[in-house]
Interface confidence: low
């Protein structure tokens, strides 16, 4: 037993209570004063906070209960203050006292991982033992009550590729992993409290692993062998052909440049087309059909970055074989852009020039361009390449055309070449806001003032980068209508409130409220929108939702009394 | 109205890392695109990298990776832009910008600017 | 070096009209829009032409900018003292994946 220093006849034991007990009362222990000799004359009370509702004391015994279910993870700790009365005098035999209740902890809560979601990044190739990520779970528990919040990592899945250090939550690599064969990985790992003694809890989490590049694959030609033409009338920087090396990496690693070997004439070069990573075979002289018909060369690829440690693996360039066969012949025009994007804002008059494509002969004689222009009937070209509008442009109908300009050489139309055009129409503010339903509005004739009556909303057709945001206003021309009100909600919404108390069907069957809708364009439209406000007679309940059938007799020309 | 606000300037030694802050206001964090642009002493703009405030992805200039970390914390509506290893060269003034909702699309607004100083 | 090309320097006297070129690649340029930024002494850049060339709201119609295969250009008609700036133009770069700037244009207004 425990004495109390302050309060010397009181006698009570350390007190602890189990969380989670479902029985209705669980004896907690029992409070006495060495001054009561068991015939029932004291009085024992129990204050303070779950005094009663929580814990109760039997009043001759001491004894304490709890008779509540008590959870140490919402409040671990009880602070109580006890009394003892003699029941003869009804005076205090003891001095009040403060007593503790302890809530014990009880194994009822699986280790948590709170910084979900985890992603990690990591080379492929990467050694065993590299860190990838640390995952940390968290048991609400008490810690200093066995082993119930003491945590063991496990690896559900991820194995062979992945380990996990149990009691860190470290995990690292154990065997090495070709981003080119998979580049992302989905781990779980399970953590279980009691150090994965019988009876733990356990909580999973997921890791993405995704695997960052190295430059471990060398470009390789999947073609060996090329077979091009070129008319001898080619200009000097004319595209022969496009050859295409292959490389598994990505981004940078990927990044290739190409050159010519056994060329000893130099006619020929390899430029790179950087989208693509192709490489355009140009022509660095002039060839003569008459004097050589076709030219035999190698071309070499290799990566523009290699890393000294990655070296071995780009060892042997690729290379493939090209045959170059002079023709003598006329060629087709030829544009100066693959494709074209034009742009105009949208709302222009008729024969806007909306720009210009342009395309050229390159055989020697330069023969002049004719363009045909299809795709649209909106836009037409002339004889320099230059597209205009034959009609105003209206975003809302097509904010984008595709168009196809065809170019054909005036001295042999046979030589027919084409481009595609893409015209982007930019957005004016060109549509003013407008209702976005028609309202079927009804007010009571018994409404008060301030009831709502209908609450509206807009749409406007154009399109914003910024949300759209609505004006709604009252007309100031709807001088005749005092009997509601408009509120902006400042949401693209605005509710209309009755002003009045009481309407009257037969004097005012229906009332034309003007509403302004503006919205936030630059410069900012308006519409001016009218809703109608049937009154109605919706008996005691002042619900509308009747009025649509009367309104409907009343707009046939009937009237229900 | 849009807001981009920095913290205040550093003086750091080579070698040291700073992180500096911008802290986005009046539009919605997670519809833009940030992005950091540095301007040393005398020269131009240099793009440093673009971070995805929605889901936090990042994308860096080839210039700095591996030295620049650049994340976000949404209940704060405030990017960070961490440079590490230090050097002279460093020295700059570190703006923050938004992007549009596209990653060709122009920086409509900008920070005030923080001025980094790499100094033994 | 920038991987867009612009003078570095530019004069003008007020009421003049000067242009300012930025020269890159398909890469950039000739795949993407250009953007102007200009610059007052001691503060950040602000946008003054987006998308080849639209003028943000509060931008004079004095700044005008256009873009025509791998180059761009901007326009200042009417100079005044108060366009005494530097100016950057802008694109993104399909190649690198990134923002690519011209090095700058230091305009001065003489007189």
């Known amino acids: 037993d425990y004495k109390d220093d302050d309060d010397k006849g009181w006698v009570w034991n350390q007190f602890f209570v189990p969380e989670e007990m479902n029985t209705t009362s669980h004896h907690i222990g029992q409070l006495r004063s060495d001054l009561d000799n068991g015939n029932n004359s004291f009085q024992y009370k129990l204050l303070g906070a779950g005094a009663g509702s929580t814990f109760i004391i039997d009043e001759r015994t001491g004894d304490i209960y709890a008779i509540q279910k008590l959870d140490r993870e919402e409040r671990s700790l009880y602070i109580l203050r006890a009394q003892v009365i003699d029941i003869a005098t009804g005076r205090a035999v003891e001095p009040e006292s403060e007593f503790v209740i302890k809530v014990s902890d009880i194994n009822d809560n699986e280790p948590r991982f709170l910084d979900e979601p985890y992603e990690a990044i990591v080379p492929e190739m990467s050694p065993e033992g590299t860190f990838v990520i640390k995952v940390t779970a968290n048991d609400a528990d008490d810690p200093s009550t066995g082993y119930h919040a003491r945590i063991l990592y496990n690896l559900e899945r991820g194995q062979p590729y992945f380990s996990v250090e149990p009691t860190t939550g470290v995990i690292r690599i154990s065997s090495k992993m070709d981003r080119e064969l998979q580049d992302t990985y989905c781990v779980i790992i399970q953590a279980k409290d009691m150090l994965g003694q019988p009876g733990a809890l356990s909580g999973t989490t997921t890791v993405s692993i995704k695997l960052s590049d190295i430059n471990d694959n060398k470009p390789i030609f999947k073609e060996s062998f090329y077979r091009f033409t070129i008319s001898e009338s080619a200009p000097i920087g004319t595209s022969i052909g496009k050859i295409m090396a292959y490389d598994d990496d990505i981004g940078e690693n990927a990044e290739m440049e190409y050159s010519i070997e056994d060329d000893d004439s130099k006619i020929f070069d390899i430029i790179i087309d950087n989208d693509t990573q192709e490489g355009i075979v140009i022509l660095k002289k002039k060839v003569d059909f008459e004097q050589q018909s076709y030219y035999g060369i190698r071309a070499k690829v290799k990566n523009c970055h290699v890393d000294e440690e990655l070296a071995p693996a780009h060892v042997n360039a690729s290379t493939t074989y090209i045959k170059v066969q002079v023709e003598d012949e006329d060629e087709p025009p030829v544009f100066l852009l693959p494709y074209y994007i034009l742009e105009i804002p949208e709302g222009k008059p008729y024969g806007t020039i909306v720009g210009t494509v342009s395309a050229t002969d390159p055989d020697r004689r330069q023969s002049p361009m004719r363009y045909y222009l299809t795709g649209s009937k909106m836009f037409d070209i002339n004889d320099n390449g230059t597209i205009i509008t034959t009609n105003m442009l209206d975003r809302e109908v097509s904010a984008w055309y595709n168009l196809t300009v065809t170019a054909t050489e005036t001295y042999n139309v046979q030589q027919i070449s084409s481009a595609h055009v893409y015209v982007q129409v930019f957005n004016i503010n060109d549509n003013a806001p407008e209702f976005s339903q028609f309202y079927e509005t009804y007010v009571c004739e018994n409404a008060e003032s301030g009831e709502i009556v209908q609450i509206i909303s807009a749409i406007d057709r154009d399109e914003s980068i910024e949300d759209h945001h609505f004006y709604f206003n009252h007309s100031l021309e709807d001088t005749n209508n005092s009997s509601f009100m408009l509120t902006d909600n400042q949401d693209n919404t605005a509710v209309i409130l009755s002003n009045r108390t009481g309407f009257n069907l037969k004097e005012e069957p229906v009332f034309y409220m003007i509403i302004l809708i503006a919205d936030n364009g630059i410069p900012s439209l308006t519409s001016t929108n009218t809703l109608t406000i049937q009154v109605c007679d919706c008996g005691d309940s002042r619900n509308t939702e009747t009025c649509a059938n009367k309104g409907l007799l009343f707009i046939m020309g009937f009237r229900t009394e | 109205q849009v807001q981009l606000v920095q913290s205040g300037a550093e003086v750091k030694k080579p070698g040291a890392s700073v992180k500096v802050s911008c802290k986005a206001s009046?539009?919605?964090?997670?519809?833009?695109?940030i992005h950091w642009v540095r301007q040393a002493p005398g020269q131009g703009l240099e793009w440093m990298g673009i971070?995805?405030?929605?889901?936090?992805?990042?994308r860096y200039a080839q210039k700095f990776q591996g030295r620049v970390t650049m994340t976000r914390d949404t209940s704060t509506s405030t990017v960070f832009m961490e440079l590490s290893s230090l050097r002279s060269e460093d020295t700059a003034v570190y703006y923050c910008?938004?992007?549009?909702?596209?990653?060709?699309?122009?920086?409509?607004?900008w920070g005030q600017g923080t001025l980094v100083t790499v100094s033994s | 070096q920038s991987a867009l090309t612009q003078p570095p320097s530019a004069t003008g006297t007020p009421g003049q009209r000067v242009t300012i070129s930025c020269s890159g690649s398909s890469s950039n340029i000739g795949r993407n829009f250009v953007n102007w930024y200009q610059q007052l002494p001691g503060t950040a850049p602000k946008v003054l032409i987006y998308t080849n060339n639209q003028r943000p709201s509060g931008v004079p119609d004095r700044f005008s900018g256009s873009k025509s295969g791998t180059s761009a250009s901007l326009a200042i008609s009417g100079l005044q003292s108060e366009d005494e700036a530097d100016y950057y133009c802008a694109a993104w770069d399909d190649s690198l994946n990134g923002w690519v700037f011209g090095g700058g244009t230091k305009l001065t207004v003489l007189g």
């Open positions: 910008a938004r992007g549009g909702i596209q990653l060709w699309l122009h920086f409509d607004y």
């Open positions: 971070i995805n405030p929605s889901g936090g992805s990042t």
């Open positions: 009046g539009y919605t964090f997670t519809s833009y695109y």
